[in-house]
Structure formats: structure tokens, C-alpha cells
């Protein structure tokens, strides 16, 4: 019985199914395009199991291949608004350490008000992911409209 | 040899990699915004391993963090017709038990004809997920255009 | 200690967490709507662990349920361009063996310049996945804008 229980725990502890789902906290000051995230059961349905937040940015704690996903909805938006303020672009990337800085995922809104995508990417312990929203439109803070998460997939 | 076999089964049975991918069965009567789903190998490439269908809605059988994903394409659509009924919105949420009712994922079509997104969320045994399509435009029943699924990720 | 290490390897070797993330190599000649993919650490952040490339198309090596995901961004694109060249459509499907040929995922660009989606689907060893982009617009080769991947989820 104890053996079976130990087995159940292995994937979480040894293999480290690190996972996080974050909700938008706030946008940065005008010259800072980064979105600032928050997570934790007290906030609703967001959580961090493994990764951590560092000043609103997500820091990876375990090497591996991760599924990174994001959805961002613009707050006050119609297809007309979205195209008037073109280009509004979202980019997810590794922003630190600087030596590993790279854009992982990039989408423009064009005439839409929501972008959503996902991708597999190798990440290393200490990598910090930043999500940059360029343009003059603000993202919705509704937790079912704007969210960002990672899921450890394999070493 | 027997030990290795037992190991292979553990994640499926003990850890319970519950997973489901559903295809659209039908829409509800006019006052019911819910989409009704179906799944099973006889229907094509849809399946349920763990979760169940309850009157076309997906019911969760195992507590855990799940990746929920959905794509819905409007049946007859151009960028002009997509905005014929504004707003046409898709929302995925827990609709029962009522005490846990919440919107998990929400997207509007604006001038687009397809929405697709995914997110990580904690779900509990007995949670029923509903997908509400508000508006007067019909979703395509083509299995490569409209689908809805969940994947258990970790406890 | 050796026991714990053996455990850690089991999911990768016995359960076979096959995974691949590919970047666009090139498009086909005019009459060939297929996108040709490439992957490997030398190319950047793309990789193949299990699946293989066969003339730029992804071939599956292990039976199971997979999460298939894709993002394609059109290279020179505005909402006007996208709608002028309508319909530009992306379809992901099993293209060989011919007996298993089927469309798994289909999206049109309409007035957008990026499509992104994902779905769960059963795949068998030997299945080759093709991604067909119909229309006259070219996909971006930027690795953060256009990518295609699969992740083994369960047997």
C-alpha cells in the first residue's frame, strides 16, 4: 500500500510536474510593455506549483520542455477599435537571464480583440518569462478573458 | 518484467490521466445557449477516458488540474456575417454543482469565424462543464472545425 | 537511490512521452499546399523526441492520444490583405497511410493574419501529419510566429 502511494507521488516530486496558471494583476508604467501577473488560490482559480513569480513575471524552477499558453483579451474593444490601434502585438519570451533572451510566441490583434495560442519550448531553471503587450489598448483583467500559464511536459 | 508492466499502468490507473475529446452533437433549443457534445470511437476521433457525458455536457470524474481546450467555428461565416449578431460569444464554465458555477474561458468572435483557446484550471469530481454560445449564429458540426476537450495534468 | 533514478526514466522510456516542436522550413512548389517543417536544437528551440521528419512532414513513432498544436502567421499581412485573399485556410491532417487519411484541424484566416489552435487526437505509429495551407499568401518563417508540434498524452 505504501509502495503504491509512493508511486503516485513520484511524478509530482521526482519528475516534477511543475505547472502554473496566472491572472493579470496590472500593466506596467507607460514605457514598460510588460504585463504583470499574479496567482494563488486566494485570487480565484490561478495557482503556482513549482514556478514562482518575481515582480509579476514568471520564473521557472525546473529544467524541461514546457507547454506555454496564453490568452489576452483587449478591455474595451470592437473590430473597429482593434484595427484603429494597429499594431497591437503580444509577445511571450524569455527576458532573463539576458544571455537566453528570446521571443517564444508572438501574435498581433489586427481586427480581433482576443489572441490565444500555445507552444512547446525548452525552459531552464531560472528562466523568467515576460509577456509584452505593445500598443495603446489595455488588456481585460477578467480572469476568464486574460490568463497565462505553463505546464512541464518532460525533461 | 511484471514490475515494468505494473509501472506502465500506474499513471493511467493510479494517477488517472483522464482525457476526453468531444465533437458537437447539436445546439439546444433557442433559449438554451449550451452546446451539446458527443464522443466515442464509433463517432470518429472523439473519445472519453474517465470523464463522462451527462445530457451532452462533460462531467469530471477525478480531482485535479486540467488543460481545457476548445475550438468553435461558425457554420456559415465570412468576416461580414460573423458580426451579423453582435456579440457572438463562447464561454466555457462549470455549470454544476451550482455552488461551483464559474466562467473559465470566454471569447468573442468579433469579425472572425473561429475561436480557439485553452487554459489550465482546477476541476473536482462531479464538476460539469458547459459551453455556452450566445448569439444567433450556428456552430459548424464538422469534426475538424468544432471540438472540445479536457486533459488531466496533475493532482 | 538507483531505484528513484529508474523511476524517473520510466515515463520517458516505457510510457514514451514523445514530443516534437517544429519550425517552418519552406512551402512546397505551387501545386503542393503542404508546409515543410524542420526541427532540432541546431535550428533554435525546435526539437524531436520520438517523432521523426519525413521529407518535412511529421511521422509518429508511438501509438497514443496526442495533443496537436499549431500556429501559422501570414508573412505580409493586414486585415485587408487577409480578406482580399480569402479563403486562406490551414488544415492539419493524417496524410499517410492513405487508409487513415483524415482532416484533424481546420481554420480559415478571414480578416486575421494568425491562426492558432490545438486538439487531442488518437495517432498511430506510422501516421504522417501534413499541414496544408491553401491560398496565395505565404506563411512567416519567424520561429515565434509559425510553429507546429505534438505531445504524447496517454496510450
Amino acid at each position: 500500500q505504501r509502495f503504491a502511494q509512493a508511486q503516485q507521488q513520484l511524478p509530482l516530486e521526482s519528475l516534477g510536474w511543475d505547472v502554473a496558471e496566472l491572472q493579470l494583476n496590472h500593466t506596467g508604467p507607460q514605457q514598460d510593455p510588460r504585463l504583470y501577473w499574479q496567482g494563488g488560490p486566494a485570487l480565484g482559480r490561478s495557482f503556482l506549483h513549482g514556478p514562482e513569480l518575481d515582480k509579476g513575471q514568471l520564473r521557472i524552477h525546473r529544467d524541461g520542455i514546457y507547454m506555454v499558453h496564453i490568452q489576452v483579451t483587449l478591455a474595451i474593444c470592437s473590430s473597429t477599435t482593434a484595427s484603429r490601434h494597429h499594431p497591437t502585438t503580444l509577445a511571450v519570451g524569455i527576458c532573463s537571464p539576458a544571455s537566453r533572451s528570446i521571443s517564444l510566441l508572438r501574435l498581433s490583434f489586427h481586427q480581433g480583440c482576443t489572441i490565444a495560442s500555445q507552444r512547446l519550448t525548452p525552459l531552464a531553471r531560472g528562466d523568467t518569462l515576460c509577456t509584452n503587450l505593445t500598443g495603446t489598448l489595455l488588456p481585460s483583467r477578467n480572469t476568464d478573458e486574460t490568463f497565462f500559464g505553463v505546464q512541464w511536459v518532460r525533461p | 518484467q511484471r514490475f515494468a508492466q505494473a509501472q506502465q499502468q500506474l499513471p493511467l490507473e493510479s494517477l488517472g490521466w483522464d482525457v476526453a475529446e468531444l465533437q458537437l452533437n447539436h445546439t439546444g433549443p433557442q433559449q438554451d445557449p449550451r452546446l451539446y457534445w458527443q464522443g466515442g470511437p464509433a463517432l470518429g476521433r472523439s473519445f472519453l477516458h474517465g470523464p463522462e457525458l451527462d445530457k451532452g455536457q462533460l462531467r469530471i470524474h477525478r480531482d485535479g488540474i486540467y488543460m481545457v481546450h476548445i475550438q468553435v467555428t461558425l457554420a456559415i461565416c465570412s468576416s461580414t456575417t460573423a458580426s451579423r449578431h453582435h456579440p457572438t460569444t463562447l464561454a466555457v464554465g462549470i455549470c454544476s454543482p451550482a455552488s461551483r458555477s464559474i466562467s473559465l474561458l470566454r471569447l468573442s468572435f468579433h469579425q472572425g469565424c473561429t475561436i480557439a483557446s485553452q487554459r489550465l484550471t482546477p476541476l473536482a469530481r462531479g464538476d460539469t462543464l458547459c459551453t455556452n454560445l450566445t448569439g444567433t449564429l450556428l456552430p459548424s458540426r464538422n469534426t475538424d472545425e468544432t471540438f472540445f476537450g479536457v486533459q488531466w495534468v496533475r493532482p | 537511490q538507483r531505484f528513484a533514478q529508474a523511476q524517473q526514466q520510466l515515463p520517458l522510456e516505457s510510457l514514451g512521452w514523445d514530443v516534437a516542436e517544429l519550425q517552418l522550413n519552406h512551402t512546397g512548389p505551387q501545386q503542393d499546399p503542404r508546409l515543410y517543417w524542420q526541427g532540432g536544437p541546431a535550428l533554435g528551440r525546435s526539437f524531436l523526441h520520438g517523432p521523426e521528419l519525413d521529407k518535412g512532414q511529421l511521422r509518429i513513432h508511438r501509438d497514443g492520444i496526442y495533443m496537436v498544436h499549431i500556429q501559422v502567421t501570414l508573412a505580409i499581412c493586414s486585415s485587408t490583405t487577409a480578406s482580399r485573399h480569402h479563403p486562406t485556410t490551414l488544415a492539419v491532417g493524417i496524410c499517410s497511410p492513405a487508409s487513415r487519411s483524415i482532416s484533424l484541424l481546420r481554420l480559415s484566416f478571414h480578416q486575421g493574419c494568425t491562426i492558432a489552435s490545438q486538439r487531442l487526437t488518437p495517432l498511430a505509429r506510422g501516421d504522417t501529419l501534413c499541414t496544408n495551407l491553401t491560398g496565395t499568401l505565404l506563411p512567416s518563417r519567424n520561429t515565434d510566429e509559425t510553429f507546429f508540434g505534438v505531445q504524447w498524452v496517454r496510450p
Epitope: - | A75, I76, S83, R84, H86, T136, L138, N142 | -
Partner: antibody, heavy 118, light 111 residues
């Protein structure tokens, strides 16, 4: 309850312009498109096109491109059909009809009779 | 454009009997799991009234004696049993693609 009330009958001379109104009540005007349908005396129904009440974008059937214009006064929940350079063959009853998306045209105005005669 | 041909152009049916009206499309109006065909009733001096949407669905408030069927290019409106108040002209209309078109109409007379 939902109602579409159209303006009264019009008698015009060839070459003149007419503007018909269709005032909607009982629902959110900008949530549903508005169709326009022509019916010549003793004849069948002809779909003229529709206007997107949210964006204001009109779509015209080929036979109604040029002299016909759909417009809106969103604040008054009103759609308009204007016909320029009237011809005898424009003599008809014109209906506005709410576009209930893929479910057809579910509410219709009572119709506006336009007579073009010299 | 999709041409809708209705038949017959007119018919007379005895009270309590069945009236059957046919509508044929020049190309399929079915796609993505639906048939985009609708039926309307128009009485003299009145606007049309939606009876059936998406080939077979009864609009709210419409009596159950009206029914629709068909897919692809061939559609049928049935009225059974016919009542006095059903004397009217009936039109089919598709919304498969722009431009939407109507059939030429079928005038139903009650004997």
C-alpha cells in the same frame, strides 16, 4: 414586445429620392442585423440586402447596388432605406426584417408602400 | 446566385387534408451539419411570418400542423390538417450564402 414600425406610404415622381424608416423596439438594436425586402405589386419577395447594426456596414444584393443605401441612427434604434433617382419599377412595398442570424428573419415591419408615378 | 423553385405555384386543398409544398434549390443549401432553408407565410396586406427555420424547426408560436423536411437541394413544407386560416402564400428562403433568395411563392387556397 419586439416591434418594427415602418414609416408611412410614399408617392414620388421618377428621379426623386425616398427615405423609409424602420424603428425597432423591445430588443437591443445593435445585436441583430436588419434586412430589407422588396415586394412589387402581385409579385414575390426579393431580398435587397442587410445592414450590420453594430458596425454600420451594408451588404447589397447585386440588383440593388448603386441607387439604394442602407443607413442607421443607432441612438434612435432606427434603420433607413434610401432610394435615389426613383424609377417606375421601384414601385413596391418595402419591408424591414430583423436578422435572427442563421435562424431566418423572425420579426418584420408592416411594410412601406412606395409608388413612383409621373 | 442560388435559385429556389417552388411547386406548385398554387394549390387548393380541402379543409382537414394535407397540403404539400416543394422547394428545390439550384445547389445545395446544406453545410456544416445544417440545412439553411426557411419557410414563411404571407397573408394579403400583411408582412411575411417565419414558420419554419433551418428546414425542420418550428418557430415559436407556430401550430404543430406545420412541418418542414429535406436537406441538400430538396425541401418540403407540409400542413396537416389544413385549416381555414392557412389560406396564404408560402415562400421558401435560403441563407446559405449571399445573396439570400426567396422562392417564387405558392398560393394555398382552402376548398
Amino acid at each position: 414586445q419586439i416591434q418594427l414600425v415602418q414609416s408611412g406610404p410614399e408617392v414620388k415622381k421618377p428621379g426623386e429620392t425616398v427615405k423609409i424608416s424602420c424603428k425597432a423596439s423591445g430588443y437591443t438594436f445593435t445585436n441583430y442585423g436588419m434586412n430589407w425586402v422588396k415586394q412589387a405589386p402581385g409579385k414575390g419577395l426579393k431580398w435587397m440586402g442587410w445592414i450590420n447594426t453594430y458596425t454600420g456596414e451594408p451588404t447589397y444584393a447585386d440588383a440593388f447596388k448603386g441607387r439604394f443605401a442602407f443607413s442607421l441612427e443607432t441612438s434612435a434604434s432606427t434603420a433607413y432605406l434610401q432610394i435615389n433617382n426613383l424609377k417606375n419599377e421601384d414601385t413596391a412595398t418595402y419591408f424591414c426584417a430583423r436578422d435572427y442570424g442563421d435562424y431566418g428573419m423572425d420579426y418584420w415591419g408592416q411594410g412601406t408602400s412606395v409608388t413612383v408615378s409621373s | 446566385d442560388i435559385v429556389l423553385t417552388q411547386s406548385p405555384a398554387s394549390l387548393a386543398v380541402s379543409l382537414g387534408q394535407r397540403a404539400t409544398i416543394s422547394c428545390r434549390a439550384s445547389k445545395s443549401v446544406s453545410t456544416s451539419g445544417y440545412s439553411f432553408m426557411h419557410w414563411y407565410q404571407q397573408k394579403p396586406g400583411q408582412p411575411p411570418k417565419l414558420l419554419i427555420y433551418l428546414a425542420s424547426n418550428l418557430e415559436s408560436g407556430v401550430p404543430a400542423r406545420f412541418s418542414g423536411s429535406g436537406s441538400g437541394t430538396d425541401f418540403t413544407l407540409n400542413i396537416h390538417p389544413v385549416e381555414e386560416e392557412d389560406a396564404a402564400t408560402y415562400y421558401c428562403q435560403h441563407s446559405r450564402e449571399v445573396p439570400w433568395t426567396f422562392g417564387g411563392g405558392t398560393k394555398l387556397e382552402i376548398k
